[in-house]
Interface confidence: medium
């Protein structure tokens, strides 16, 4: 199986070779090259020295190669680059290239959220409701949900609202936002509104959203 | 453990269409190009095309063109092979397979028997 | 297109015998970049689905028995069973990924 690797939006990934080398023999008896799954090469290490005229144009310029880890630092990450990747190393004899190392690793591109936002979208009427947005930007993969948290001195009630999400077409990150109507439970107490954003891994909450209502008055005595 | 279930066997009529499925699991779905294969009495194995799911696109055996065509839904982790304008020749079984570099994982296969 | 020849088509030896056949490409399968003959093999017993054997010409596949050895490179390629046993009946097919795919149209190995 894969070694599976994740790394960061505009980050670098680390796509190791492992090899160990225990014969110990040296970077220029060696051919060291990463393929991606449409045999594109990102780097090749040719006797010692790095060959370019073999580098795609979309790897070109984002490589680096550590000798001391046998690792290619792949760098400026997009979400396309996810996927399988494969280092291979060749002995270069007088009688030909002898394969004696190979390594595929699975790296998936991440991008975290930006911290979820609620946006009042109109004032709270007479019905006792308020509309909201909450939105969050910039992450990937797409988020397994969002929720609004309404809670009140004596309860806390949560709404799922139906997530609409867009995908930009050159970052392929995306932009998430559900809208509520959000309608009070207990008129007579104030409420903190969180939002919530559950991804595979973490869950991203809102700064708090307040609603003070002011207590009504009480009834005037009632005199015989 | 990686699997591929295909759909079960499918009994048509000539000129009519049928569409298998392939449903992936056991990995990242989106990483793996799915292939199909055409199995037959007459012609072994015959490659039918590729899907590569993360980009979308996809190459078809040029014998193929207009007879298969490959599409996935990304959220089932599902890729399908739909068979138009079906005659006897189109009698076979049908495997999808994983494949990056070469096909590691096979489907079980899916029997299509056309006839009137 | 890119036309593989296998042969012989069909075969049958003894268990504990060694067996070889022959993969024959229309074009080189060597990626001058990559440096790897981009040819597979695979077996399919009867009733069954292909499996991987060997995929870049000569590198077996995980939990494949060392018995199976892949080799050559450019147009002429070779599976060797170096002492068949019985469970090998199966037909075998090369394949090429060079230029999207073909495969050869398969030995059949039988069991005396």
């Known amino acids: 199986a894969p070694l599976k690797i994740q790394a960061y939006f505009n980050e670098t990934a680390d796509l190791p070779c492992q090899f160990a080398n225990s014969q110990n023999q040296s970077l220029s008896e060696l051919v060291v090259f990463w393929q991606d799954q449409e045999n594109l090469v990102l780097n090749e290490v040719y006797l010692g020295k790095e060959k370019f005229d073999s580098v795609h144009s979309k790897y070109m310029g984002r490589t680096s190669f550590d000798s001391d880890s046998w690792t290619l630092r792949l760098h400026n990450l997009q979400i396309k680059d996810k996927g399988l990747y494969q280092c291979i190393i060749h002995h270069k004899k007088p009688t030909g290239m002898i394969r004696i190392h190979q390594m595929n690793s699975e790296l998936s591109v991440l991008a975290n959220f930006s911290q979820p936002e609620i946006v009042p979208i109109s004032n709270i009427t007479e019905n006792v409701y308020i509309n909201l947005t909450c939105s969050s930007i910039h992450g990937y993969p797409e988020p397994k949900k969002m929720s609004v948290l309404l809670r009140t001195k004596n309860s806390t009630i949560e709404y799922d609202g139906v997530m609409q999400k867009s995908q930009d077409n050159v970052t392929e990150l995306y932009d998430v936002s559900i809208s509520l109507s959000v309608s009070f439970p207990d008129v007579t107490s104030n409420m903190t509104i969180f939002c919530i954003l559950e991804t595979d891994k973490t869950r991203l909450l809102s700064s708090p959203f307040s609603i003070e209502l002011e207590d009504p008055q009480p009834p005037p005595d009632h005199i015989p | 453990q990686v699997q591929l279930q295909q759909s079960g066997p499918e009994l048509v009529r000539p000129g009519e269409s049928v569409k298998i499925s392939c449903k992936g699991s056991g990995y990242t779905f989106t990483d793996y190009a799915i292939q199909w294969v055409k199995q037959s009495h007459a012609k072994s194995l015959e490659w039918i095309g590729v899907?590569?799911?993360?980009?979308?696109?996809?190459n078809y055996n040029q014998k193929f063109k207009g007879k298969a065509t490959m599409t996935v839904d990304k959220s089932s982790s599902t890729a399908y092979m739909e068979l138009a304008r079906l005659t006897s020749e189109d009698s076979a079984i049908y495997y999808c397979a994983r494949a990056a570099w070469y096909m590691d994982y096979w489907g079980q296969g899916t029997s299509v028997t056309v006839s009137s | 297109d890119i036309v593989l020849s296998q042969s012989p088509s069909s075969l049958a030896v003894s268990a504990g015998e060694k067996v070889t056949m022959s993969c024959k490409s229309s074009?080189?399968?060597?990626?001058?970049?990559?440096?790897?003959?981009?040819l597979a093999w695979y077996q399919q017993k009867p009733g069954q689905s292909p499996k991987l054997l060997i995929y870049?010409?000569?590198t077996r596949e995980s939990g494949v028995p060392d018995r199976f050895t892949g080799s050559g490179s450019g147009t002429d390629f070779t599976l060797t069973i170096s002492s068949v046993q019985a469970e090998d009946l199966a037909v075998y097919y090369c394949?090429?990924?060079?230029?999207?795919?073909?495969f050869g149209g398969g030995t059949k190995l039988e069991i005396k």
């Open positions: 394949t090429q990924s060079y230029n999207l795919y073909t």
């Open positions: 074009q080189s399968l060597l990626n001058s970049r990559t440096r790897e003959n981009y």
């Open positions: 899907i590569n799911i993360y980009y979308d696109n996809t």
């Open positions: 870049w010409a000569s």
